[in-house]
């Protein structure tokens, strides 16, 4: 059937543009040929002209932006809150665990706790700048905390007979404690673990991150003028015929958009690709891959290895004496 | 063996959960997000389509606009006409993505590789040299309760994990409710309606 | 409890601008977006756009684009909307209300509102 | 944008009675539509998210039920308390828009 004939005096067009531009000067009174149109060119007389076009034209790729975050809100809410918990639960757990190894000191070793409650407090401030994507090396702060550990051990419990440690008898500790394996395999053991587990933890962020940032990029697309023309022509040129209250076809809607979104339809395969690959992380992160496991069991293996000191203290208090007496002398004189 | 911390496990005010008739594990929250993101793996293809589906479209209508002129829903020309003569769409396609588009599908390709290189190959959960040290001994490795490895007496079982998290202390678990069927399902069936 | 506390009302000369806050508590602020919304004669409602706390992105309604802005500050649970070049236009009341726990839940809990009154 | 109107400016009923709040949304917006209560002098309230599921503690008096295009909601055995503008809202497209308010007065 044949269109109906457009307004003969163009005031159904004019109240709509209105709305979208005030200041009526851009709309014809009656219909004109519209022989300047470039998009919406006209099979007979007209109610748009080039300036209208134009007008148009902005508005359809605003529509578009608005269109596109539409879209994607679901997906975006899903990931932003998902990553908001996660990095929140994972600093509520670096919390607990650090409460728990406190604990562990407050209930077994009282006499270390004011310096071990500092080390520990260290430890698990790096564990948590870690995990939000800071450039610190696991192994480097496992050691530091049982470097830290160790000279207080000693002059506490194993030699409390020492006066207050003074840094030089701690250096020679430090060193002592890594050269003779004073704690056996357990900062080996908690390396791997923490290692594991948080490299774990800190991927799965970024990558929750990262799907942020994809869809915000493809959120805020500036699209090319040929793809706003063939917006302009699918949403608005229809106005031009007094054509109201008419709707794009499914169909060619489709064709104007795979055309619009040809390049970022590109992204599809690494798309998929991202959530497999994710799904593969998370389903190992369980036993030591699972920063929640390790972290919360921390406490049990570190007074493990404090236990594993005491075992053999009367050895090592030996062996340091000898290793660090030259620090001592320089204390007791 | 180590003086256990249950006074931080009972602390009522860190662990009380939002719903106990439904307590949320880090782990069982994380398999629940990737359900939902997998119902989203082809976002990207469907695009154009969801973009449709929020756009107004003749859907109840008789007629509707081809960029030409007013046809008939379901006439060949619904779709075709409107393309012709106008702009060459394979050319638009040829185009290629823009710069943004190029560096986010790189920032992605690096991302799926660190992704992949992480992953835990299946039955590789302990390593060899974890083994070494003794660290499967015992009975640890039921769902409930994990083992956290340390040889001898010292071997604790941790109470399988903060129940989730009780300082998030609301319900975040909505996503039965009605009407919220991802938009994998629910909009590529819509989308179909209008084909010409 | 779950409360969004406004600031208390304003009187202002047209001009530069105007910053309104929403203290959240309650809740875990990161989680959930926070909306704003303008009601104008004691009626008319419109959505002025969203963040999201977590990493400070924002949506907005192209009406309001370069109108408000919104920020938040995640150490005290607070989000902030800025009015910019003030007008008559700008008086009405402007709420904050938090989007549910999970996309579909629309805004479930809103501020006591704010109300703005620009009038030289 | 997509215009969400509520026809009913004024609706009149008396308490016990049953009244139905209607909302047409200019385009497709699924189920995404929710409802809200705003008493005199007071912040919206939400009642009915995603079309017909009710906000915690909201009476069980209050129904929302539609999809597409119309929406309503539904108050039977109406309650003194229930004077109020009732607003619909919908969030399948940015913007988020809001219906004009349907006020509901008791005779």
């Known amino acids: 059937q044949p269109p109906p004939p457009p307004d003969a005096t163009c005031h159904q067009v004019r109240s709509f543009f209105q709305r979208l531009q005030p200041g009526l000067k851009w709309v014809p009174e009656t219909p004109v040929p519209g022989s300047d149109l470039q998009v919406c060119l006209p099979k007979g007389p007209t109610c748009c002209s080039r300036k209208m076009e134009e007008k148009y034209q902005l508005t359809a790729r605003l529509n578009m932006e608005q269109l596109l975050q539409s879209a994607s809100m679901e997906l975006k809410f899903l990931i932003i809150q998902n990553a908001a918990v996660f990095q929140e639960a994972f600093e509520i757990v670096v919390r607990h665990a650090k409460n728990y190894t406190n604990a562990m000191f407050k209930n077994n070793y009282p006499s270390l706790t004011p310096q071990a409650f500092e080390f520990v407090g260290e430890f698990f401030t790096d564990v948590s700048l870690y995990i939000l994507g800071s450039d610190i090396n696991v192994d480097d702060m496992v050691n530091e905390l049982f470097d830290s550990l160790f000279p207080v051990i000693y002059t506490q419990m194993m030699n409390p007979g020492l006066p207050e440690s003074v840094l030089d008898i701690n250096e020679c500790l430090r060193g002592a404690r890594r050269d003779l394996k004073v704690f056996g395999s357990f900062p080996k053991l908690i390396m791997t673990q923490v290692s594991k587990s948080l490299q774990v933890t800190r991927i799965f962020l970024q990558a929750l991150n990262l799907g942020i940032e994809v869809i915000n990029t493809t959120d805020h697309l500036k699209f090319s003028k040929d793809c706003g023309r063939m917006l302009t022509r699918m949403w608005y040129c229809s106005y031009c015929q007094g054509l109201m209250m008419v709707k794009p076809c499914g169909g060619y809607c489709n064709v104007v958009m795979q055309g619009c979104m040809a390049g970022v339809v590109e992204i599809d395969k690494y798309w998929r690709e991202y959530i497999l690959s994710l799904e593969e992380l998370v389903n190992g992160m369980y036993r030591i891959y699972d920063m929640e496991n390790v972290l919360l069991g921390l406490f049990s293996t570190i007074h493990d290895s404090i236990q594993y000191v005491q075992k053999n203290g009367g050895k090592l208090t030996t062996t340091i004496g000898k290793l660090c007496a030259h620090s001592q002398q320089r204390q007791y004189r | 063996s180590a003086y256990y911390p249950e006074d931080l496990f009972i602390d009522k005010k860190i662990l009380k959960v939002a719903h106990v008739e439904h307590e949320e594990t880090l782990s069982s929250r994380r398999r629940e997000l990737i359900q939902k993101l997998k119902s989203f793996i082809n976002f990207y293809s469907a695009l154009p389509g969801y973009i449709c589906s929020h756009s107004p479209v003749a859907e109840n209508d008789t007629l509707c606009w081809n960029g030409q002129e007013l046809v008939e829903r379901y006439s060949q020309k619904a779709a075709r006409n409107g393309m012709k003569n106008q702009f060459n769409l394979h050319e638009l396609k040829m185009k290629g993505p823009e710069p943004v588009v190029s560096q986010i599908i790189d920032k992605l390709k690096h991302i799926n590789q660190l992704l992949r290189t992480m992953s835990v190959p299946k039955g590789k959960v302990l390593d060899k040299s974890l083994d070494e040290e003794g660290l499967e001994s015992g009975d640890c490795g039921d769902d409930e309760d994990e083992c956290i490895g340390s040889s001898g007496d010292g071997m604790v079982k941790v109470k399988n994990q903060l129940r989730f998290l009780a300082e998030l202390a609301y319900d975040l678990d909505v996503d039965d409710a009605p009407g919220n069927k991802q938009h994998g399902n629910q909009k590529d069936n819509e989308i179909t309606t209008s084909h010409s | 409890e779950v409360q969004l506390q406004q600031s208390g009302p304003e009187l202002v000369k047209p001009g530069p601008s105007l910053k309104i806050s929403c203290k959240a508590s309650g809740y875990s602020f990161t989680v959930s977006p926070m909306t704003w919304v303008k009601q104008s004669h004691g009626k008319n409602l419109e959505w002025i756009g969203l963040?999201?706390?977590?990493?400070?992105?924002?949506t907005y309604n192209q009406k309001f684009k370069g109108k408000a802005t919104l920020t938040v500050d995640k150490s005290s649970s607070t989000a902030y909307m800025e009015l910019l070049s003030l007008t008559s236009e700008d008086s009405a009341v402007y709420y904050c209300a938090r989007w549910g726990n999970y996309y579909p839940y629309a805004m479930d809990y809103w501020g006591q509102g704010t109300s703005v009154t620009v009038s030289s | 944008d997509i215009v969400m109107t509520q026809s009913q400016k004024f609706m009149s009923t008396s308490v016990g009675d049953r009244v139905s709040i209607t909302c047409k949304a200019s385009?497709?917006?699924?189920?995404?539509v929710a409802w809200y209560q705003q008493k005199p002098g007071q912040s919206p309230k939400a009642l009915i998210y995603?079309?017909?599921n009710r906000h915690t503690g909201v009476p069980d008096r209050f129904t929302g039920s539609g999809s597409g295009t119309d929406f309503t909601l539904t108050i039977s055995n109406v309650q003194s308390e229930d004077l109020a503008d009732y607003f619909c809202?919908?969030?399948?497209?940015?913007?988020?828009?809001f219906g004009g308010g349907t006020k509901l007065e008791i005779k």
């Open positions: 963040i999201h706390p977590y990493n400070g992105d924002t």
């Open positions: 995603l079309t017909s």
């Open positions: 809202l919908q969030h399948w497209n940015y913007p988020y828009t």
């Open positions: 385009q497709n917006v699924r189920s995404t």
